[in-house]
Interface confidence: low
């Protein structure tokens, strides 16, 4: 339904607080280097303008699109060219090209200082002194570092962030109360950002059809009692929400997400029996809860899939009449019966089924041709099952840190051209699949593991796209969204790689390593491990293990020494020499 003033419409729907927060997120995700104060000023100007439009929708400029209004506002930033370079050229374009241009300049790895958490007392004082600014700063800092963060979900995180400070700054032991909550928000936030980044990549790189297929599979697993028409309606609405958020249309996205939550709760009887608790919560919690809700129980006595999709004489007729609807029904029926499969596996099965029908429905005897199509599924199902079994065994044997190290070596040998920080970050995240998923029973392992790996490998893909260095990574990332993980799994050692020159500086350590947290110390050691493999890609596991054990002993020894810096200097030289000898460098 058309509104005379889109900005007034969204302001009224969302309310001033959410409107301001979402505009701040939008601006921070576009102009990631701008100071906080500049963004607050822009947001206040947009808000004041929106209020004039609420008062009189016919007022000057109130009929302009949100992209036009926001883009014009962003283009008033005086330092645009010196701060962002060619992004300033976007301002010479007209909508919708201008917004597309801004989107293309979003940076997944912006050059921003690492967020350092201050003392609890500092944070509590800041929170009490100016709660509004403190919370805005949180939105700003997260949004600029995660330019695809799902905006309505970030409002939910901010609400929890505020609740944590409200509660803990009054507690007897503020730190004991607050720090675990902040750790949890940080970890959940990183996971949420990565999951949303995959959704946006799916839409932007592979198109709406790919995203809709993913949504059909996931929602069918989650709501197996809902009928196909209901799932299709939810998929259409969900696709609109994510298309808007990924496109920077955050006000529309948040508004439509609220409408979708309302619809789901009004129709929960025909969707899922698991929604009752979610639907009693306030809006932000409700939407989050629905997105995370557990799978409903499968209906009893579901008939065999073969009847409609293999044995029926109408298979090719039904397929020809409405290909995507028929394939959607196949995906829906298969997914609701298989909560034990990963979404990407279900999509591979649907793709195999589609390819078979394309070939067979043009054959002399279609039925004879596609009669054994379900047999083709067996190896596709067994491949991830076997991989997960092997890797969970390895994880249980090694523990998380050493399992990460095994993956670091594996992936550095596959794609040694990728930057060391990216290899460390991605391999550490890949390694977390162990503690995240291996504890689950068989029936939950694959959806947990393979869908999580899809999220992590997408991080590799988006980081690599910014600075492409490996044809093999580009190939695995771009050929097929659902086959990314099998593509990376199938990569062997890159025989074309010319080993990196040895540089002693890379393996020089100082006393500051002793004061690092366990996690940061692990990252330092894992960085050294990647560099070792880049110098000596043919090194055996045993050689690398020996060097890493020596390295750990060296760090432990020097951190206990009275003169730490001298120990690191002298013992470090010996370690480098011994490592070179051990690896034949």
């Amino acid at each position: 339904d058309a509104h005379k003033s889109e900005v007034a419409h969204r302001f009224k729907d969302l309310g001033e607080e959410n409107f301001k927060a979402l505009v701040l997120i939008a601006f921070a995700q576009y102009l990631q280097q701008c100071p906080f104060e500049d963004h607050v000023k822009l947001v206040n100007e947009v808000t004041e303008f929106a209020k004039t439009c609420v008062a009189d929708e016919s007022a000057e400029n109130c009929d302009k699109s949100l992209h036009t209004l926001f883009g014009d506002k962003l283009c008033t930033v005086a330092t645009l060219r010196e701060t962002y370079g060619e992004m300033a050229d976007c301002c010479a374009k007209q909508e919708p090209e201008r917004n597309e241009c801004f989107l293309q300049h979003k940076d997944d790895n912006p050059n921003l200082p690492r967020l350092v958490r201050p003392e609890v007392d500092v944070m509590c004082t800041a929170f009490h002194d100016n709660e509004e600014t403190f919370l805005k700063k949180y939105l700003y800092e997260i949004a600029r570092r995660h330019p695809y963060f799902y905006a309505p979900e970030l409002l939910f995180f901010a609400k929890r962030y505020k609740a944590a400070f409200t509660e803990c700054c009054q507690a007897a032991d503020k730190a004991a109360c607050l720090l675990p909550k902040l750790d949890e928000l940080r970890d959940e936030g990183k996971a949420s950002s990565a999951k949303q980044r995959l959704k946006c990549a799916s839409l932007q790189k592979f198109g709406e059809r790919a995203f809709k297929a993913w949504a059909v599979a996931r929602l069918s697993q989650r709501f197996p009692k809902a009928e196909f028409a209901e799932v299709s309606k939810l998929v259409t609405d969900l696709t609109k929400v994510h298309t808007e958020c990924c496109h920077g249309d955050l006000l529309e996205c948040a508004d439509d997400r609220a409408d979708l939550a309302k619809y789901i709760c009004e129709n929960q009887d025909s969707i899922s029996s698991k929604l009752k608790e979610c639907c009693e919560k306030p809006l932000l919690e409700k939407s989050h809860c629905i997105a995370e809700v557990e799978n409903d129980e499968m209906p009893a006595d579901l008939p065999s899939l073969a009847a409609d999709f293999v044995e029926s004489k109408d298979v090719c007729k039904n397929y020809a009449e409405a290909k995507d609807v028929f394939l959607g029904m196949f995906l829906y029926e298969y997914a609701r019966r298989h909560p034990d499969y990963s979404v990407v596996l279900l999509l591979r099965l649907a793709k195999t089924y589609e390819t078979t029908l394309e070939k067979c429905c043009a054959a002399a005897d279609p039925h004879e041709c596609y009669a054994k199509v379900f047999d083709e599924f067996k190896p596709l199902v067994e491949e991830p099952q076997n991989l997960i079994k092997q890797n969970c065994e390895l994880f249980e044997q090694l523990g998380e840190y050493k399992f990460q190290n095994a993956l670091l070596v594996r992936y550095t040998k596959k794609v040694p051209q990728v930057s060391t920080p990216t290899l460390v970050e991605v391999s550490r995240n890949l390694g977390k699949v162990g503690s995240k998923c291996c504890k689950h029973p068989e029936a939950k392992r694959m959806p947990c593991a393979e869908d999580y790996l899809s999220v992590v490998l997408n991080q590799l893909c988006v980081l690599h796209e910014k600075t492409p260095v490996s044809d093999r990574v580009t190939k695995c990332c771009t050929e097929s969204l659902v086959n990314r993980r099998p593509c990376f799994s199938a990569l062997e050692v890159d025989e074309t790689y010319v080993p990196k020159e040895f540089n002693a500086e890379t393996f020089t350590f100082h006393a500051d390593i002793c004061t690092l947290s366990e996690k940061e110390r692990q990252i330092k050691k894992q960085t050294a491990l990647v560099e070792l493999v880049k110098h000596k890609p043919k090194a055996t596991k045993e050689q690398l293990k020996a060097v890493m054990d020596d390295f750990a002993a060296f760090v432990e020894k020097c951190c206990k020494a009275d003169d730490k810096e001298t120990c690191f200097a002298e013992e470090g030289k010996k370690l480098v020499a011994a490592s070179q000898a051990a690896l034949g460098l």
């Epitope: 200082p113 967020l115 201050p118 003392e119 500092v122 002194d129």
Partner: nanobody, 124 residues
């Protein structure tokens, strides 16, 4: 308002040392996070080090870790930066900064008050 005055800059040879001081007046010093930033000719201002109110936390830029040490004496309303193993690339105007409420120590926009700077030149 808080006034900050830096001192201790000068010319030093590579490998040499200096100790910078920053004296604060006009506020309750012990309630401020204190930071040092620097700006080399033709470059942007960059974070060097910071220290929390009660010296519980210190933070350093990667480029100075292990060489520079930040400390404070709340009884003297002074923050110090000890510069060791100086290199030519450390040449810059060093600024002291104070922040009443900071979320992120390393960001210059978080700091409310700034000194005029003291020049450090590392040259042979």
């Amino acid at each position: 308002d808080v006034q900050l005055v830096e001192s201790g800059g000068g010319v030093v040879q590579p490998g040499g040392s200096l100790r910078l001081s920053c004296a604060a007046s006009g506020g309750t010093f012990s309630t401020y996070v204190m930071g040092w930033f620097r700006q080399a000719p033709g470059k942007e201002r960059e974070f060097v080090a910071a220290i929390s109110q009660n010296s519980i936390h210190t933070y350093y830029a990667d480029s100075v870790k292990g060489r520079f040490t930040i400390s404070r004496d709340n009884s003297k309303n002074t923050v110090y930066l000890q510069l060791n193993s100086l290199r030519p690339e450390d040449t810059a105007l060093y600024y002291c900064a104070a922040s009443r409420f900071t979320s992120w120590y390393t960001a210059d926009y978080e700091y409310d008050y700034w000194g005029q700077g003291t020049l450090v030149t590392v040259s042979s």
